[in-house]
Structures are given as C-alpha cells and as structure tokens.
C-alpha cells in the first residue's frame, strides 16, 4: 500500500510524522519538535503544538489585557519545555539562561529571572475569555442560535464538553466565548479548555491544526460566520506575580 | 486498538425491558469522546438512539428519549443501554460506537428480537 | 430534526466504472459534521470520511468527500470488487444525529 492509501497521518494534528510502525503495523504519530507519542482521536497538547511550531516559526500572538489579573500572549513564541505528559514545565528559560514561571497554556506569569528562579507549581489557567469580532452582515445574529453553533463547535470539533462552556455573550458585531474549567473539574480525558482555545485561535485565523479536515466552516442557520480579529484573555487560579514596575 | 463489543439477551417480550452492555477494550471510557447506542430493523437503515459522556451526562433521540436509558461505568469501562415498554417494532441490531467526529469503532452489533 | 436524502437509491455499475453518491439534508449543515459509511451485509457501518472529506485511518485514497451546506458527494473513483454495499451519509453538527437511508451500490 502507499502512505496514501493507508492513510497514516493523524486527524487531530498535522504537525506529526506518523508511520505505520505502532503494535499490530497500526499508524503511529510523534509530535514535531519533541518525538513524543501523541493521541491523535483528541486535541494535543498546545505546549508539544508550540514545540513543533519551532521548527517552522510563524508571526507571534499578541493579546491584550482586559483586567489586572488576566494574562496576555505578548511575549510571542518560544521553544517550552513540556513534562511527560505534555503539559508546560512549571519554569521555562531559552537558551541565555533567562527563566520564568508560566501557566497551564505557556502565558509567562512572573518577572523574568535567572536559574535561581522558583516556580513550585504549574499554576492553572481556569477561565479563558475569547474576544471574537464578526465581519458584517445583512443582520445580527440570533443570540440563542449562535450560542448553539458556538456550543456545538467546542464539542464536536474541539471534544469539549458542553460543560466547559461557561456562556456565549453577543452584542454584534462582537462575540465573547467564556470557557470555565477549574483543577477540580477536569476528569482524565477531558480535553483542556487552554488547548480547545488554542486550536479555535489556529482555526479562525485559517491555521488549522487539524489534518486534512478542511478550515473552519462556521455557519449560524446556514449563514456564514467569518471571524476578522480574535483576542484571548486568560485568567489564572492564583493571581500572577509581576512587580510594581512592570504595571506601572 | 480500540475495540467494542455489545452483549444482553437475544430475545426480549414485548412491553418488557431491553437491557444491553457494551464493553471498550484498548482505550478508556473516561476520554473525550461520547460513546453512542445505534440500531438498525432487520433490511432497514441505521437510527441512532442515544449518547453518554464519561460523567453521565446523555443525549438522547427525541423519538426514543422516554422510553430509553443510557447509562456508563467508568469502573469497568463498559456503557450500558436500557428501552423499556419495547413491541415489535424495536426489534433489530443493536450497535455501540464510538462518536469522534464521526462513528469511528463500532461494536459488530446484536440482534434483539421483540417476539413473546 | 434534519433529514438527510441520499440518492440515487441504488446505483449499478461494474469494477473500474466511477460511482457518485449524493446527500442532501433538509437544512444547511456545516461540512465539519457530515460524514459516510460504508455497510457490508452481517457487518457493522465503517467509517469512511468525516468532516465532508477528511479520510478515516486506513480508507483507501479512491475514496473522497465534497460538498457544503446542503449538498455533499461521496466519489469512489474507480469501483473494486470490495465497493460493492450500502452507504450511508450522517450528520453530528445537531442532536439528534441523523443518517441518510442508504445508498446501494452494486454490481451491473
């Protein structure tokens, strides 16, 4: 057989090299970047999605800060360290020795130091704020409709349990998308809410991380949904720790 | 290699209870995906009855929701669904599956005849 | 609920021959929540593609999806003797999921 004909590629992630080597010749995948094993019947991890993005480096995320206590993506992208089960490392340093601590989905959460710097736990992100703006249309959408299809999206496309969908407030042409999931929540198997945004940020900007499954077709009773600016605002289980001067 | 397999009894009596189980081997119960109960009468197509998440939550088809319970052990792995009130008409094979983006393991299906 | 008519009801063609197969669902349906089977007799549906025309693990290439909105297509390109059986469409973009009656492909 080709590789086409056994299709051995992973659904879930296209940033993989994947060969029919697994028990039984079943198809196997390995993240880019990290070799690691991945699961590809859900969402990889963002901090080994990260790791593969390395090797082929886009423009960085931007975001901006809605309130004292929310964290934004501005430092760009950088090479994480993630632990065995790809998760981010508590503590993240490049190559000049330069260290910090940073959340559940990679945000830095504290003044930059130096090896000396102590991160003691990875410190969860359990509310995400996704900030949507739509392109115009002939009208605006119906609320209770647009929440369904958001709801449904987080679900079918993203495995994220309706649950974790905390509200879907619209006053057009801006959409906001509120994800909740709290340590204590979030069951073996549940699909990260910091992961579900990321692969939602990738869609909307017609970076689809998901293999050969075609872009975003969002669609509210049959009207075409176009997204034309995202902002993501991340808020942590414990506050961030930055210093006077960096919020002055 | 994830794999299904459905098992109860063949033969059920009209207005009584229709209990089957399905196992999930190689791979667990508690991931992201929903795990779905399909039927299909004998030479006709393929209707789908319902849904359970590994924290219980369901979703049911409307035409079958009052008389249909599904339910999940995540202990042993295994999902469960009950039809009560059953006639003629709920004879047929009965699948499990897998629902991630799409039906994509299915069990190889059990035949269940409503005959007094 | 949304209801989805395949057709034609069943197609006859020989081995080698291109077969065509159609869906259409009663209200507009987003391609990333249509997928085919494919039904032997005595087997359990097998997943074909998802997402319109993303190919399952193991689906041979001959196989592809199309379509949007209302209107999708199953293609096989070129008929082999193990294409011979029923297929179905399903949509999983709204509860509750719902296939198509099947399409029967069989041997002229």
């Known amino acids: 057989h080709t590789a086409a004909q056994d299709n051995c590629t992973c659904p879930t992630n296209k940033m993989t090299v994947c060969s029919p080597d697994g028990p039984g010749g079943r198809c196997q995948c390995r993240a880019l970047g990290s070799g690691v094993a991945v699961d590809c019947s859900t969402l990889t991890s963002e901090c080994l999605l990260l790791k593969a993005r390395m090797s082929a480096p886009k423009n960085a995320r931007t975001l901006v800060r809605p309130n004292e206590h929310a964290l934004v993506d501005n430092d760009g992208l950088y090479d994480p360290d993630c632990d065995p089960e790809g998760r981010f490392k508590a503590r993240q340093c490049n190559q000049t020795s330069v260290c910090w601590c940073v959340n559940s989905v990679g945000v830095r959460r504290t003044d930059k130091g130096d090896l000396s710097l102590r991160c003691d736990e990875l410190v969860r992100t359990h509310h995400i704020l996704i900030d949507l703006r739509h392109r115009p249309t002939a009208g605006a959408f119906n609320h209770s409709d647009l929440d369904a299809e958001l709801r449904r999206l987080f679900r079918e496309r993203y495995r994220l349990h309706p649950k974790f969908v905390a509200a879907v407030h619209y006053e057009q042409p801006t959409i906001q998308i509120e994800l909740r999931q709290n340590t204590s929540q979030k069951a073996a198997g549940d699909v990260d809410i910091g992961d579900a945004a990321y692969y939602f940020e990738r869609d909307v900007k017609g970076e689809s991380l998901f293999q050969g499954r075609g872009g975003l077709d969002l669609r509210v009773r049959g009207e075409p949904l176009q997204v034309e600016r995202t902002l993501i605002y991340y808020l942590d289980e414990i506050p961030p720790k930055f210093s006077m001067k960096r919020l002055t | 290699q994830v794999q299904l397999q459905e098992s109860g009894p063949g033969l059920v009596k009209p207005s009584g209870t229709l209990s089957l189980t399905c196992a999930v081997s190689?791979?667990?119960?508690?991931?992201?995906?929903?795990w779905s109960w399909v039927r299909q009468p004998p030479g006709k197509g393929l209707e789908w009855i319902g849904e359970?998440?590994?924290?219980?939550?369901?979703d049911y088809n409307p035409s079958l929701k009052s008389r249909v319970i599904i339910s999940v052990d995540k202990s042993k792995n295994q999902f469960s669904l009950k039809v009560r009130s059953v006639t003629a008409a709920d004879t047929a094979v009965y699948y499990c599956?897998?629902?991630?983006?799409?039906?994509?393991?299915w069990g190889q299906g059990t035949l269940v005849t409503v005959s007094s | 609920e949304i209801v989805l008519t395949q057709f034609p009801g069943t197609l006859s063609l020989s081995p080698g021959e291109r077969a065509t197969l159609s869906c259409r669902s009663s209200?507009?349906?987003?391609?990333?929540?249509l997928a085919w089977y494919q039904q032997k007799p005595g087997q359990a549906p097998r997943l074909l593609i998802s997402?319109?025309?993303s190919r399952a693990t193991g689906i041979p290439d001959r196989f592809s999806g199309s379509g949007s909105g209302t209107d999708f297509t199953l293609t096989i390109s070129r008929l082999e003797p193990e294409d011979f059986a029923v297929y179905y469409c399903?949509?999983?973009?709204?509860?509750?999921?719902?296939f198509g009656q099947g399409t029967k492909v069989e041997i002229k």
């Open positions: 599956a897998r629902d991630n983006w799409g039906f994509d393991y």
């Open positions: 190689g791979g667990s119960i508690s991931s992201s995906n929903w």
């Open positions: 359970i998440y590994h924290d219980g939550s369901t």
């Open positions: 209200q507009s349906v987003s391609s990333s929540y």
């Open positions: 997402g319109a025309s």
């Open positions: 399903q949509q999983y973009g709204s509860s509750p999921r719902t």
